[in-house]
Amino acid sequence: SSSPTSSASSFSSSAPFLASAVSAQPPLPDQCPALCECSEAARTVKCVNRNLTEVPTDLPAYVRNLFLTGNQLAVLPAGAFARRPPLAELAALNLSGSRLDEVRAGAFEHLPSLRQLDLSHNPLADLSPFAFSGSNASVSAPSPLVELILNHIVPPEDERQNRSFEGMVVAALLAGRALQGLRRLELASNHFLYLPRDVLAQLPSLRHLDLSNNSLVSLTYVSFRNLTHLESLHLEDNALKVLHNGTLAELQGLPHIRVFLDNNPWVCDCHMADMVTWLKETEVVQGKDRLTCAYPEKMRNRVLLELNSADLDCDPILPPSLQTS
């Protein structure tokens, strides 16, 4: 993940009794919340692996990098980081692995400088559509977020509240067009089977998109055309069987793109011919010499770059094992 790493500066720990005594008041300039480590020089607060059940109220106003990883927060309510005075400097917030299952509307409001947010490794059964936009207006104030890390946020099957997980995440990404400035989006390891049509067109500033280790079976309706700034597209470890002409042309038309396609179950029949031709010519696919056929059986483990049209005939019926990843 691309969240900030800690500075080597010295950290001060606070005694647990100090914070509770003043939590209702504005924090003192040098105060550090209970169970946290603070470095004013590094503008960093770490409250890591402390089983916290809520966000400390007495965070120092200087905090620029806040680590709240490995806790038991469960719910992030509206205004979870709203303070008087506001945490105006907070730029990087890491909440990964904190057992969050609900992030409510406006959870990140009143953080005017927040550029990096990492919610990875939380079983987010309930991510409000307005978690990042803060309001249900059709056009919200632009979010300052530049990097949003949402790897492995899929909850267990029995906690998914009988609705589309893909849809829930997409709603939060698109609400109010607040994330138009987003440059890095990581959505790896979320069991995504599909992306709703045109979703990426609404995130035009993307430079880096990570969709690896999902279950995407097709990119036919995923348009990359508007993503002219896209530099890296990670599609490794999905269930892609072939990329069709429209997708190939769109990828080739992106000026800075690097695409990663390893470990997909490519079907090497006659429909693969265009992709093989493209792979032989393109420079955009990283490690293209590692791409191999998964099906039909006679083609298993053949390198795509080594195939010619005579190798690619139709029409196989896939065995059940290849139907769903």
Epitope: P129, S138, S164, G167, V170, A171, L174, A175, L193, Y194, L195, P196, R197, D198, V199, Q202, V217, S218, T220, Y221, V222, K241, V242, H244, H271, C314, D315, P320, Q323, T324
Partner: antibody, heavy 118, light 107 residues
């Protein structure tokens, strides 16, 4: 929960026009394409076209290109289909359906019956 | 337009039977096939998308398979509430087209 509420049944004269509405609730209207589908009595389903509520872009089945016009009103989360120059061939139940996985329709309205009769 | 030929048109079944419906596309539609159930007087309901993926809340007795042009929809153990018309649909190429439907009726 997701709901698509369609307008009521219509009985119209040949040559007339009709405009069917489909009010969406329970999801972000602009995030998903809206499809329209025709079902004649005792028959299969025919895809009429779809519309992207985000920008109003449409995609029609050529068969219905001169018959149907799809529009949306984002302010009211409502999709519309206008059918013109109606004949008895156009008597059917018309459904609006929200797209989930691309092309597949995961929520359907209750249907609007259109009867063309003189 | 891609034609989806669905067979059979009718199926007489008993509770507990295994039922298989097939759909053949006039040209390859890759893995872009959905299956719907329509009960009398109701709107269609999405059961399967991308050939084999059950939609949310759909019981696991409903399965789909296939690739390219030939697709199969199976109900492993038919129950009384499964009596309905089932449709396949290709979503590979516009216009999206449906099969003619298969009506499941009890013996």
């Amino acid at each position: 929960q997701v709901q698509l509420q369609q307008s009521g049944p219509e009985v119209v004269n040949p040559g007339a026009s009709v405009k069917i509405s489909c009010k969406a609730s329970g999801y972000t209207f602009t995030d998903y394409y809206m499809n329209w589908v025709k079902q004649s009595r005792g028959k299969s389903l025919e895809w009429i076209g779809d519309i992207n509520p985000n920008n109003g872009g449409t995609n029609y089945n050529q068969k219905f290109k001169d018959k149907a016009t799809l529009t949306v009103d984002k302010s009211s989360n409502t999709a519309y289909m206008e059918l013109r120059s109606l004949t008895s061939e156009n008597s059917a139940v018309y459904y609006c359906a929200k797209e989930g996985p691309p092309g597949a329709m995961d929520y359907w309205g209750q249907g609007t019956s259109v009867t063309v009769s003189s | 337009n891609i034609v989806m030929t669905q067979t059979p048109k009718f199926l007489l079944v008993s509770a507990g039977d295994r039922v298989t419906i097939t759909c053949k596309a006039s040209q390859s539609v890759s893995n872009h096939v959905a299956w719907y159930q329509q009960k009398p007087g109701q709107s269609p309901k999405l059961l399967i998308y991308y050939v084999s993926n059950r939609y949310i809340g759909v019981p696991d007795r409903f399965t789909g398979s296939g690739y390219g042009t030939d697709f199969t929809f199976t109900i492993s153990t038919v129950q009384a509430e499964d009596l309905a018309v089932y449709f396949c649909q290709q979503v590979y190429s516009s216009p999206f087209t449906f099969g003619g439907g298969t009506r499941l009726e009890m013996k």
